[in-house]
């Protein structure tokens, strides 16, 4: 069902695995990190080289896009269903262009249903990527270029690019434009985690991963 179950069934090697939707036979391919912090992590987002366009439609963010071995978005529908079955933690791992790494760990994470615009719910922040959450609290609805739920008449998804839980427009966007090294500063629509790197700094790499809290 998720990478934690795959791990417990004896598959302890990093890689792409076929997962199934809860209470369903529908399948989805995801990258499983079986090494970091004890393994069992389902990767729900990865940015690393700018090879995939993240300025996508609501439907594409719903079902997922990209390549699980590289840059991808797993899909809001799967993540919503999964995180409403049991309690999950969310870990966000970040890399800058100077060789630094940081993370934010939320001890409870879930997405509401599509009817509620995949609103993000987060509790219990720890980690090295800022003492304040760079995802606005309380969580906001998901927005895309064709699904505007951002608490702003400014259309954050179009201006900042990418789908995200924008809050007029808020201190993060890990699905922004990918800027290569030496072009990554003073970019207002880049890959941003404000309470780590401040504004205008576009990150080198990001990974969002989830795992059951009782793993």
């Amino acid at each position: 069902r998720d990478c934690a179950e795959v791990f417990k069934s004896g598959h302890t090697t990093n890689g792409i695995y076929t997962l199934t939707f809860p209470n369903s036979t529908e399948e989805i391919k995801a990258y499983c990190d079986m090494e970091a912090g004890g393994g069992g992590w389902t990767i729900i987002q990865r940015r690393e080289d700018g090879s995939v366009d993240f300025q996508r439609t609501w439907k594409e963010y719903k079902v997922g896009f990209g390549n699980p071995s590289g840059e991808y978005w797993l899909g809001n529908e799967f993540v919503s269903q999964l995180t409403n079955q049991q309690r999950y933690v969310l870990k966000i791992h970040l890399k800058d262009w100077e060789g630094n790494e940081a993370y934010s760990l939320y001890e409870h994470f879930y997405l509401s249903s599509e009817e509620l615009n995949y609103r993000i719910h987060l509790k219990g922040l720890t980690g090295t990527a800022g003492k304040i959450s760079s995802i606005s609290q309380p969580g906001n609805d998901f927005s895309t270029k064709d699904g505007d739920n951002d608490n702003c008449i400014c259309k954050c998804s179009q201006m900042l690019t990418g789908g995200w839980w924008f809050d007029a427009c808020g201190p993060s966007n890990l699905n922004g434009m990918y800027y290569p090294q030496r072009q990554n500063t003073n970019k207002f629509n880049g890959i941003k985690w404000y309470y780590w790197k401040g504004s205008g700094y576009s990150l080198k790499a990001t990974t969002m991963m989830i795992r059951p809290a009782d793993f």
Epitope: C154, F188, N189, Y194
Partner: antibody
């Protein structure tokens, strides 16, 4: 409500330095940035640079690079702009203005009341 | 740097007239554009951001339009209190840059 209150009128001689302060109230200082903009008599608006209230990152207009320094004091929610080696054509009203740095929005609202800096021998 | 060119540089209009001020950017801005009003002896005031979003408290006779490189500020039914100088500003990248200003006089 959000307020930016700047320091008073300054009269300086050529070659001197001036430091203008901008004290803020009514919002979370660290969520925002500050631009400094000047306006010479009868002229338009000229951007000098920007500083983040969160981590002190700065970006200066090339014209003022090496001559301007922007700083913040989070304990007093105050931003500062120092301009060195003043010339007569630096005579202007200097404004501080807030932006929504954490949202990457660099439109300016509100503005301070302005500080008139006169450079004359 | 992104150059902002405003036109006209001044306009004289009667109360009730429609006034249109244009702003052209030297490169595409998406919607990263703001408009300000400045009256003599006072600081500029934000009217519109994101090219077309009216700032809270600004009368609805002001509107903004455009994206990319061409933008416009429209004042529908000009009022006596609308005199002053209007500036556009790009917020797409540093350095922030302003247009040269448009002076609006009431006939």
């Amino acid at each position: 409500q959000v307020q930016l209150v700047q320091s008073g009128v300054e009269v300086k001689k050529p070659g001197a330095s001036v430091k203008v302060s901008c004290k803020t109230s009514g919002y979370t200082f660290s969520n925002n940035g500050f631009s400094w903009v000047r306006q010479a008599p009868g002229q338009g608006l000229e951007w000098l640079g920007w500083i983040s209230g969160y981590n002190g990152n700065t970006n200066y207009a090339q014209k003022f690079q090496g001559r301007v320094t922007m700083t913040t004091d989070t304990s007093t929610s105050t931003a500062y702009m120092e301009l060195r080696t003043l010339r007569s054509d630096d005579t202007a009203v200097y404004y501080c203005a807030r932006d929504q740095d954490y949202s990457n929005f660099h439109w300016l609202d509100p503005w301070g009341q302005g500080t008139l800096v006169t450079v004359a021998s | 740097d992104i150059q902002m060119t405003q036109s006209p540089s001044s306009v004289s209009a009667s109360v009730g007239d429609r006034v249109i001020i244009t702003c052209r950017a030297s490169q595409g801005l998406s919607s990263w554009l703001a408009w300000y009003q400045q009256k003599p002896g006072t600081a500029p005031k934000l009217l519109i951001h994101s090219a077309s979003s009216l700032q809270t408290g600004v009368p609805s006779r002001f509107s903004g339009s455009g994206s990319g490189t061409e933008f416009a500020l429209t004042i529908n039914s000009l009022q006596p209190e609308d005199f002053g100088t209007y500036y556009c500003q790009q917020a797409n990248s540093f350095p922030l840059t302003f247009g040269g200003g448009t002076r609006v006089e009431i006939k």
